[in-house]
Amino acid sequence: LTCLGGFASPGPVPPSTALRELIEELVNITQNQKAPLCNGSMVWSINLTAGMYCAALESLINVSGCSAIEKTQRMLSGFCPHKVSAGQFSSLHVRDTKIEVAQFVKDLLLHLKKLFREGQFN
């Protein structure tokens, strides 16, 4: 999580701050959504459990050409300890269920807000 503040960061970003910033970005996406997010692209649904940050990134990284979620993809990479590339899938994906990116973001946002409220940052 130390790199989440970018090169200008004076030091490591506290996990709670990093999570709050990710939540705020997801809120921003949902509130500014006019046309269908990412042209209605579909992504694999994930289990919102341990390891979900990498799973979320693995799902979203397969969406290309969608500037609205690029910042989210970058932020999620800061929470995931390993490098994620397109086409990669973890056991956390619900491989028989695809949902729209907008719904994926909404579900992820709800879960992350509750993790923040409960003090679960990692």
Partner: antibody, heavy 120, light 112 residues
Amino acid sequence: EVQLVESGGGLVQPGGSLRLSCAASGFNIKDTYIHWVRQAPGKGLEWVGRIDPANDNIKYDPKFQGRFTISADNAKNSLYLQMNSLRAEDTAVYYCARSEENWYDFFDYWGQGTLVTVSS
Amino acid sequence: DIQMTQSPSSLSASVGDRVTITCRSSQSIVHSNGNTYLEWYQQKPGKAPKLLIYKVSNRFSGVPSRFSGSGSGTDFTLTISSLQPEDFATYYCFQGSHIPYTFGGGTKVEIK
């Protein structure tokens, strides 16, 4: 319009059981936390516990753990408080309340309360 | 468990008076996410509580500006700058930072 409506209160004998309901409308219970709070006659407010209906994550005040059980039925958008081994000191008005939906910072809506009287 | 101690337990005041209610927690109620979930609720007889102040000093929407909250760490205050007839009620502080969440014992504000 957001609404919470409790029901199921009444007179019960010591040692008996009662199941309270909290019917929610105007929002999806999975989007927030629902709490149970009680108030004995002429006394202060007491937090009983809360549930996250999205994943059935439930927390109680330890004094109620074991005797009281909080649950949710997402299909019915309703919450429940199952109370067992009731004692006279459980006599109170029982409220359900929801955490506001943005950052869950506070209770923004409460039900009207339902009175539970434990007496022989 | 965190104890929330309110004082006074009751007070008599007149319309126009400045009223201060204090609440002390038995330990810090700063949450691990950095927020302090300290709220103030107003309750009138036979009614459900109503939120006045959240996160120590934030006034809830629709709450008159005469209500204000302050404090940090373990000591918190609710102030009513100029008491109005509709303010005669019981006031509770509440901490939602550490489970089990806890209410203060209440302060009943009565007409002098």
